[in-house]
């Protein structure tokens, strides 16, 4: 799997999980989230060469098509596969609120 | 939706469905498929600017992150959203076989 266990251990130009820390205030301009101040969002990036972690029949076909037709621009792309939620604390006035924000953290990637 | 109805009607540099006909023999080197000779596989391509068809909270956050941090390389990517199967006919000796190949045709795209 193109996850932290594999990608953060290996120097990999191909599609892989990349570390990215997002500070809510500095990077997004969101001042209302009290905790956490930021989080490890991560992101997916890298080349998708022939059959590198292709996730659908279409991306496999596209991968083969590109190998045979190298001038083509129809190549698969490195995107998130597994995502996890993030729990945040914010305040409504003085009242604390806890919310779970879905699909905020990328755990693994794929070529699609 | 970034589907044929929208994308094939509009000239769109941003993430959109692109037409792609694949000839099994010429483009993939597959001679064993009897029918069809090829099919409209389509593919997804184009830029993913700020919030253009972002499909997850993570891709929305990443989109905002890129707007505020333009030097960052952590941008969403244009990939397939809805896929459909393709039915093929091939022969085992003289015996015809009909198979449905899943996820072979891209019907719409998203930024992920």
């Amino acid at each position: 799997a193109l996850d932290a266990a594999y990608c953060f251990r290996n120097v990999q130009d191909n599609c892989c999980l990349r570390p990215l820390y997002i500070d809510f205030k500095r990077d997004l301009g969101w001042k209302w989230i009290h905790e956490p101040k930021g989080y490890n969002a991560n992101f997916c990036a890298g080349a998708c060469p022939y059959l590198w972690s292709s996730d659908t029949q279409h991306s496999r076909v596209l991968s083969l098509y590109n190998t045979i037709n190298p001038e083509a621009s129809a190549s698969p792309c490195c995107v998130s596969q597994d995502l996890e939620p993030l729990t945040i604390l914010y305040y409504i006035g003085k009242t604390p609120k806890i919310e779970q924000l879905s699909n905020m953290i990328v755990k693994s990637c794929k070529c699609s | 939706a970034l589907d044929a109805a929208y994308c094939f009607r509009n000239v769109q540099d941003n993430c959109c469905l692109r037409p792609l006909y694949i000839d099994f023999k010429r483009d993939l080197g597959w001679k064993w498929i009897h029918e069809p000779k090829g099919y409209n596989a389509n593919f997804c391509a184009g830029a993913c600017p700020y919030l253009w068809s972002s499909d997850t909270q993570h891709s929305r956050v990443l989109s905002l992150y890129n707007t505020i941090n333009p030097e960052a390389s952590a941008s969403p990517c244009c990939v397939s959203q809805d896929l459909e199967p393709l039915t093929i006919l091939y022969y085992i000796g003289k015996t015809p076989k009909i198979e449905q190949l899943s996820n072979m045709i891209v019907k719409s795209c998203k930024c992920s």
Epitope: G93, E99, L101 | -
Partner: antibody
Amino acid sequence: EVQLVQSGAEVKKPGASVKVSCKTSGYTFMFYWMNWVRQAPGAGLDWMGQIFPAWGMTNYNEMFEGRVTLTADTSTSTAYMELSSLRAGDIAVYYCARGYGNYALDAMDYWGQGTLVTVSS
Amino acid sequence: DIVMTQTPPSLSVSPRETASISCRASESVDSYGNSFMHWYLQKPGQSPQLLIYLASNLESGVSDRFSGSGSGTDFTLRISRVEANDTGVYYCQQNDEDPLSFGQGTK
């Protein structure tokens, strides 16, 4: 230019529901809190609740809890306020108003033009 | 709930004079070094518009004839060199506690 454009006036019967829309433009709708405020004829302003469109997070004033539902459609940058079990006391102008952005509960820097809801049998 | 009381309920001011409106909260609206008090003007037939943010910060595009002061429970909005265009209802608003609440208005 930030704009909040609300749907037109409504006339409803007692016990019915009303759904008011607020179409926004000129800013990133999904990343700002959207508030709803009502103003009865000749009266002051009452905060009804708020929604953060990106995640659909909502906070309601207990005074309206159970009768008001706030939703948002990020694809069209439109916020909605639905008020059920309408009664004569709900006759008012209803406003959508964008939160300032520093806090969840905050001042409101842009307002819609208002939607008059009349309840009459 | 925090109750906001504005005085006076109505006010008539001659052009070029100074007007003062008071807003008293039923409990302190100060937290984390800020006063969570804001002022709005609602002109006849219009929506409210934000004038003052966090007790004393002039909102962008608002005339510097408007100023806000105060802390804790007592706040004041001052309008210097009053113009006919300043006619309307002025509201204070707190967001220190849920639910957010407004004063009853000063005309």
